[in-house]
């Protein structure tokens, strides 16, 4: 029962996760133009992985897609690419889990499939999450570096008299979402890691027992069904793992399809 | 059709606090930000202030203490109350509609305020 | 504040000729998150409300005739009236719509010679 209930809640906390995964990574607000110690314009400015957006004191707001693939910093690209390998490792990881759930029958299902299929799940959330806070962490640390380094423009080359307002730009909703889904999913993988071990049959120790037939001597020693745990060559196993990585291949052209919506 | 139109007294005492209502029609203030404007007699304009969809405001620093500008979104009313008028008040007070650009697209035909006793 | 100086204050040019009006702010209103100046043009005639003619230093309003260009970028900004009509003569205002507070240029008053 409290395998089941491990289970269960490893896989819904992983379904909220890349949920918020795909919230962050489609979300404008990765960074927001900072207002502190600022002039107060009339513009906000605020950009996401895919386009960057202006919204007017009026309330009128105005979003550009970044048009161009190769124009784009490289940090920018390493996050989608973060981003996007966790929502596919996460997505297949929902798929595969959902067929692992115990309170769920599927034909003859063994338990030890089951297993297998759980601790499959439970490393795709756990990478999935690392993917996330990676890519994450990433973007804020070029956030800060990018920040500091226009604080420091703001105060040098101001001899001439005309100012010109340097747009800093500070965390954004997105990061945070990003954070606290990464680490969901985390969770989630981890809870499912565990259910694995309480999913697969502990080897049966019996104690030998001899039966005398007349005339020979032969011991049965029942015992010894040892469950597959996940790491010896489950050919469903290996199907999961190669349709991860065709779908992992065939994802990469996304942000390029994306910025010429 | 676009309409604001302002009213309000045409004569205030010094001291006095101004009072004024911006009526609009063609538009909900839910949609759009209204702006108030003054123009001294033969002078320049001069921006005050402004109310924004969701209720927030922004004022010119330099009239900051004495400004404050409401609406009535049932009502489609934005008013604009000064505090402690004098002479240098005395002006054309303009309601307008912000549009792209924080642009003023639209402007009422204004209402003149005189401050004298 | 934004101070916003326009030259001339007073221009007089003949019908069908060129006018062209200068305003400059003291900050650059160009926003770098959409590379666009944040500067709008009004035409004020005597005994009415101004009128929206540019916005976002270039972009004409819709119903302004094509002879009004707004051009510039940063600080410095330019109105121009092709063929000056006799119903062109009025006050021209230039406004920061960028850094409040959302200040004025003093105005030009244009005439016919």
């Known amino acids: 029962m409290a395998v089941t209930a491990c289970q269960g809640l490893g896989f819904v906390v992983s379904l909220i996760g890349i949920a918020g995964i795909i919230a962050a990574t489609c979300m404008d607000q990765w960074s927001t133009q900072d207002l502190y110690n600022n002039p107060v314009t009339a513009v906000f400015n605020y950009q996401g992985l895919w386009r960057s957006c202006v919204r007017e004191s009026s309330g009128f707001t105005e979003c550009r897609g970044y048009f161009t693939l190769l124009g784009l910093p490289a940090m920018l690209q390493a996050v989608r690419a973060l981003m996007i390998v966790g929502i596919v490792l996460g997505a297949i990881g929902l798929l595969v889990s959902i067929f692992a759930l115990k309170c769920i029958r599927i034909g003859s299902m063994e338990d030890s499939a089951k297993a297998n299929m759980t601790l499959t799940s439970g490393i795709m959330f756990i990478v999935s999450g690392l993917c996330a806070i990676a890519g994450v962490s990433v973007f804020a640390n070029m956030l800060v570096t990018n920040f500091w380094m226009s604080t420091a423009n703001m105060y040098t080359g101001m001899g001439g008299m005309v100012q010109t307002v340097q747009t800093r730009y500070t965390f954004g909703a997105a990061l945070f979402v990003g954070w606290v889904a990464g680490g969901l999913t985390l969770i989630g993988g981890v809870m499912m890691c565990i259910a694995c071990r309480g999913l697969a049959p502990e080897e049966t120790n019996y104690k030998a027992v001899s039966y005398h037939a007349s005339g020979h001597s032969v011991a049965y020693k029942p015992g010894g069904f040892k469950a597959s745990t996940g790491f010896g060559s489950n050919t469903k196993n290996k199907k999961i793992y190669d349709g991860g990585a065709r779908t992992e291949d065939e994802v990469q052209s996304y942000p390029s399809k994306h910025d010429y919506v | 059709q676009v309409q604001l139109k302002e009213s309000g007294p045409g004569l205030v005492k010094p001291s006095e606090t101004l009072s004024l209502t911006c009526t609009v029609s063609?538009?909900?203030?839910?949609?759009?930000?209204i702006s108030w404007v003054r123009q001294p007699p033969g002078k320049g304009l001069e921006w005050l202030g402004e109310?924004?969809?969701?209720?927030?405001?922004n004022y010119n620093s330099a009239l900051k203490s004495r400004v404050s500008i409401s609406k009535d979104n049932s009502k489609s009313q934005v008013f604009l109350k000064l505090s402690s008028v004098q002479a240098a008040d005395t002006a054309r007070y303009y309601c307008?509609?912000?549009?792209?650009?924080?642009?003023?697209?639209?402007w009422g035909q204004g209402t003149l305020v005189t401050v004298s006793s | 504040d934004i101070v916003m100086t326009q030259s001339p204050d007073s221009l007089t040019v003949s019908l069908g000729e060129r006018a062209t009006i200068n305003c400059k702010s003291s900050?650059?209103?160009?926003?770098?998150?959409?590379?666009?100046?944040?500067l709008t043009w009004y035409q004020q005639k005597p005994g009415q409300p101004p009128k929206l003619l540019i916005y976002?230093?270039?972009t004409r309003e819709s119903g302004v005739p094509d002879r009004f260009t707004g051009s510039g970028s940063g600080t410095d900004f330019t109105l121009t009236i092709s063929s000056l009509q006799a119903e062109d003569v009025a006050v021209y205002y230039c406004?920061?719509?960028?850094?409040?507070?959302?200040?004025f240029g003093p105005g030009t008053k244009l005439e016919i010679k």
């Open positions: 900050q650059s209103l160009l926003n770098s998150g959409n590379q666009k100046n944040y």
């Open positions: 109310i924004w969809t969701g209720g927030g405001t």
């Open positions: 406004q920061n719509n960028f850094i409040y507070p959302l200040t």
């Open positions: 063609g538009f909900s203030l839910t949609s759009y930000a």
């Open positions: 307008g509609r912000l549009s792209y650009g924080n642009s003023l697209d639209y």
């Open positions: 976002w230093a270039s």
